[in-house]
Amino acid sequence: MEVTVPATLNVLNGSDARLPCTFNSCYTVNHKQFSLNWTYQECNNCSEEMFLQFRMKIINLKLERFQDRVEFSGNPSKYDVSVMLRNVQPEDEGIYNCYIMNPPDRHRGHGKIHLQVLMEEPPERDST
């Protein structure tokens, strides 16, 4: 299985971010067997916190850090498991992992996105 994600995603502070994660598989998606986990890490060596799962249906784990700002925006039948993160904050910066299992494919797919939150530059002062 091959997973496609951007290595780094730059998002403006306060805007909505689509975290894209798509995959290729030799097999069609059987919703009874397909599984998906999205996790978040504050840093490379930090522990992973699961915030969204697919087990026959989407399960939003409603982590305190994300409150109600996460929603699933993909379609597993179309090999798309992307999520939306609303109103991105600097605290959201870090690493987002999507993990996919699509039996009978034996290989677990993994995509890793570094989310960088861009702060608005202050307007340039008029020197005249």
Epitope: G94, I95, H114, L115, Q116, M119, E121
Partner: nanobody, 113 residues
Framework: EVQLVESGGGLVQAGGSLRLSCAAS????????MRWYRQAPGKQREFVAS???????SYTDSVKGRFTISRDNAKNTVYLQMNSLKPEDTAVYYC???????RGQGTLVTVSS
Amino acid sequence: EVQLVESGGGLVQAGGSLRLSCAASKSILSFAYMRWYRQAPGKQREFVASIAIGGATSYTDSVKGRFTISRDNAKNTVYLQMNSLKPEDTAVYYCSAPAGQYRGQGTLVTVSS
């Protein structure tokens, strides 16, 4: 792999000042942003301040006018000057760059009333 090491924390009375440092083991010139976060016991981490490669700074509302972030690219170090400290500033402060790839172990700041 970049190591980030924070220092400068300690115990200070309300109204006092501290200067935190974050030293990187390699050049920080490639990091678009360097950021300071803090985490109080039992709470989520909170963004404190960031500085862009060009020097533009951003702060969380609760520290504006009291804290100043700066970076010395030649020394591969980022600083956080903290003035007029309040008990609610008590937390572990750590720096992070870029996009959460690296972060230090943190330095504890305790502000007594």
